[in-house]
Interface confidence: low
């Protein structure tokens, strides 16, 4: 159907298993970034990992439900796990079309959602799913 | 240990539907999905679809949609398998297999594709007249 | 016919080195990870190897994978008797949006 909601597809090397059975896979011709109509949910997810000032994306696409969280038009990140000391994971969902290919900021990992606090940016122009 | 333990096997005639049971021990059954593989009389295997034991959801095998559905019941750690309209190369020996690993609530339970990990024993359909 | 396509069979004497390949395209094995099962004659399959290199416990390191753009391949070192088998590679398939399989190498012992 025409209104599914299609989200920023991508799994970094390093990730074990694969999302892509939550939705369908869209060619867009090149190989990043890749789009994900989502089969289950209208709703994008992202997930980042922050060490010290770098934010490296982990995952990109589809979540499996509509779950709270998923009508925001943004994604706005909050942190949800620290797989190893230093890093701490960082996890947003968002009910528009792409609303997963970037985050607007990351607050520190020791201040969870400390209003205005702002964690590291994306230069001008720079897509932050990009720095893998 | 781990294991997953499916039903007898089945003769069934031509049009018949068949429903297979693959019982799940000592693992946490919604934590995995559950794929349905199938082989023919001396053919490899075929992947006939999932479904998510967390969830419910299901992705079927494109050549099969519509004749096949996939159900779990977490109650008794059960999943089925059950193929409709039978036809003569349907025969073949059915595994279920567990699949995919979701996530620790950071991911959400989502289905990841990693591979059949653990296997039943196999379920001999056969279809005739 | 089969997605992934394997030689239909290999030989080795023991103690040899024996490879199988298995090649696909750019939807699967291209763009997806590859896992490979062993099936012993009349008894269930077995996950051998998973996300291209990856061993499951259990599995001696005799067994290794590998993946180079849209093939990939299996080796076998020190070949024993026991490994007599038929071996499936499998992967993620996204225009099929499903699981496809190599129709299987059976593999002999001489």
């Known amino acids: 159907p025409p209104n599914r909601r299609t989200c920023v597809f991508f799994e970094a090397p390093g990730v074990r298993g694969s999302t892509k059975t939550l939705g369908e896979l869209l060619d867009t011709g090149t190989e990043l970034p890749r789009a994900i109509r989502c089969l289950y949910s209208r709703c994008c997810f992202g997930i980042w990992n922050l060490t010290q000032d770098r934010a490296q994306v982990e995952m990109q696409g589809c979540r499996d439900s509509d779950e709270p969280g998923c009508e925001s038009l943004h994604c706005d990140p909050s942190p949800r796990a620290h797989p190893s000391p230093g890093s701490t994971l960082f996890t947003c969902s968002c009910g528009t079309d792409f609303c997963n290919a970037n985050y607007s900021h990351l607050p520190p990992p020791g201040s969870p959602g400390t209003p205005g606090s702002q964690g590291p940016q994306a230069a001008p122009g720079e897509s932050i799913w990009m720095a893998l | 240990q781990v294991q997953l333990v499916q039903s007898g096997t089945e003769v069934k005639r031509p049009g018949a539907s068949v429903k297979i049971s693959c019982r799940a021990t000592g693992y946490t059954f919604s934590d995995y999905g559950i794929s349905w593989m199938r082989q023919a009389p001396g053919q490899g295997l075929e992947w006939m679809g999932w479904?998510?034991?967390?969830?419910?959801?299901?992705n079927y095998a494109q050549k099969l949609q519509g004749r096949v559905t996939m159900t779990t019941d977490t109650s008794t750690s059960t999943a089925y398998m059950e193929l409709r309209s039978l036809r003569y190369d349907d025969t073949a020996v059915y595994y279920c297999?567990?699949?995919?690993?979701?996530?620790?609530?950071?991911?959400?339970?989502?289905?990841?594709?990693?591979?059949?990990?653990?296997w039943g024993q196999g379920t001999t359909v056969t279809v005739s007249s | 016919q089969p997605v992934l396509t394997q030689p239909p069979s290999a030989s080795g004497t023991p103690g040899q080195r024996v490879t199988i390949s298995c090649s696909g395209s750019?939807?699967?094995?291209?763009?997806?990870?590859v896992n490979w099962y062993q099936q012993v004659p009349g008894m269930a399959p077995k996950l051998l190897i998973y996300s291209n290199n990856q061993r499951p416990s259990g599995v001696p390191d005799r067994f290794s994978g590998s993946k180079s753009g849209t093939s990939a391949s299996l080796a076998i070192s020190g070949l024993q008797s026991e490994d007599e088998a038929d071996y499936y590679c499998a992967a993620w398939d996204d225009s099929l949006n499903g699981v496809v399989f190599g129709g299987g190498t059976k593999l002999t012992v001489l």
């Open positions: 297999a567990r699949d995919g690993r979701r996530g620790s609530g950071i991911y959400w339970g989502v289905y990841y594709y990693n591979g059949m990990d653990v």
């Open positions: 479904i998510s034991a967390y969830n419910g959801n299901t």
């Open positions: 750019r939807s699967n094995i291209g763009r997806n990870t």
